[in-house]
């Protein structure tokens, strides 16, 4: 039942996580522009993985896509990378715990298939979440290198003075939606797995007893009881019987006077 | 990167009429808002007018009723038609644009100046 209770909690936790990783990937506040302050109106600058956006105050908002001849830095290709092999991922992750669930029945699936597709997702939704921290981290690291070198420079141009203002850009509420998306995915990748071992068939032999019925009665070929959830020959739990009560290591002997009851 | 250039400046008489241009070019996603300020010899540079990228725009009051700022988006350049001219608005005039152009980049760029003298 706790690892029906697991598996379960773990899904749902990942399935919140890539839901949030995938809002986060397509949201537009990764980075937010401080407020230009102007007597009339404040306009404001917020940008994603995908396009740059303008707003202002009177509710006017211009959207653009970034293009080639912005000639986009490495860092951003490497973030959207990372971003898309995140929900991939996580996507998979999701299809294969689905069949995985202990509480789903597909079949005669057994509880080994099913052991092995829950740790196959858990370690999909580990990648996944990983890879969205990852990603999520890097740009935020960009911002942090960006505001500390955006400081007022001046230099002189043709015909005066000409002064350039750099404007800071600080964390949208893309990258703490990001950042809580990952580690949820990562939690649920981390409860699978652990469900996995919940679920995972152990092979417990018990040293099996054989019993000897009189001297006349046919002799069955010694065989164990096997505590078994599908693993190896005795799959049906059957106690094997060889007539008298000797254990399977000591030397097999004929019935004896001793054998009657 | 991003580079502002001013035009349409010079001698005009009093009561006639200006047309000043400014472009920005350069890699522009957006260029938020663009405007005028001015600086007469001695004085403090002081804002003449601007415009967002949405349309709002804001005056001097000095200016309120005379002068007329206008732009075009797709080509990134502001408008200032200057109409009543009196010998109080000799200055340099200065076009000033707030522009995005990269990834978290951006900031506020002043174009070089134009003279525009009024002789009584």
């Known amino acids: 039942m706790a690892v029906t209770a697991c598996q379960g909690l773990g899904f749902v936790v990942s399935l919140i996580g890539i839901a949030g990783i995938i809002a986060a990937t397509c949201m537009d506040q990764w980075s937010t522009q401080d407020l230009y302050n102007n007597p009339v109106t404040a306009v404001f600058n917020y940008q994603g993985l995908w396009r740059s956006c303008v707003r202002e105050s009177s509710g006017f908002t211009e959207c653009r896509g970034y293009f080639t001849l912005l000639g986009l830095p490495a860092m951003l290709q490497a973030v959207r990378a990372l971003m898309i092999v995140g929900i991939v991922l996580g996507a998979i992750g999701l299809l294969v715990s689905i069949f995985a669930l202990k509480c789903i029945r597909i079949g005669s699936m057994e509880d080994s298939a099913k052991a092995n597709m829950t740790l196959t997702s858990g370690i999909m939704f580990i990648v996944s979440g990983l890879c969205a921290i990852a990603g999520v981290s890097v740009f935020a690291n960009m911002l942090v290198t960006n505001f500390w070198m955006s400081t007022a420079n001046m230099y002189t141009g043709m015909g005066g003075m000409v002064q350039t203002v750099q404007t800071r850009y600080t964390f949208g509420a893309a990258l703490f939606v990001g950042w809580v998306a990952g580690g949820l995915t990562l939690i649920g990748g981390v409860m699978m797995c652990i469900a996995c071992r919940g679920l995972a068939p152990e092979e417990t032999n018990y040293k099996a007893v054989s019993y000897h019925a009189s001297g006349h009665s046919v002799a069955y070929k010694p065989g164990g009881f096997k505590a078994s959830t599908g693993f190896g020959s005795n799959t049906k739990n059957k106690k094997i019987y060889d007539g008298g009560a000797r254990t399977e290591d000591e030397v097999q002997s004929y019935p004896s006077k001793h054998d009657y009851v | 990167q991003v580079k502002l250039e001013e035009s349409g400046g010079g001698l005009v008489q009093a009561g006639g009429s200006l047309g000043l241009s400014c472009a920005a070019s350069?890699?522009?996603?957006?260029?938020?808002?663009m405007g005028w300020y001015r600086q007469a010899p001695g004085k403090q540079r002081e804002l003449v007018a601007t415009q967002t990228i949405g349309g709002t725009t804001n005056y001097a009051d000095s200016v309120k009723g005379r002068f007329t700022i206008s732009r075009d988006n797709a080509k990134n350049t502001v408008y200032l038609q200057m109409n009543t001219l009196t010998p109080g608005d000799t200055a340099v005039y200065y076009c000033?644009?707030?522009?995005?152009?990269?990834?978290?980049?951006?900031?506020?760029?002043w174009g070089p100046g134009t003279q525009v003298t009024v002789s009584s």
């Open positions: 350069g890699t522009i996603l957006h260029v938020m808002v």
């Open positions: 000033n644009a707030d522009v995005v152009y990269g990834l978290a980049r951006s900031g506020n760029y």
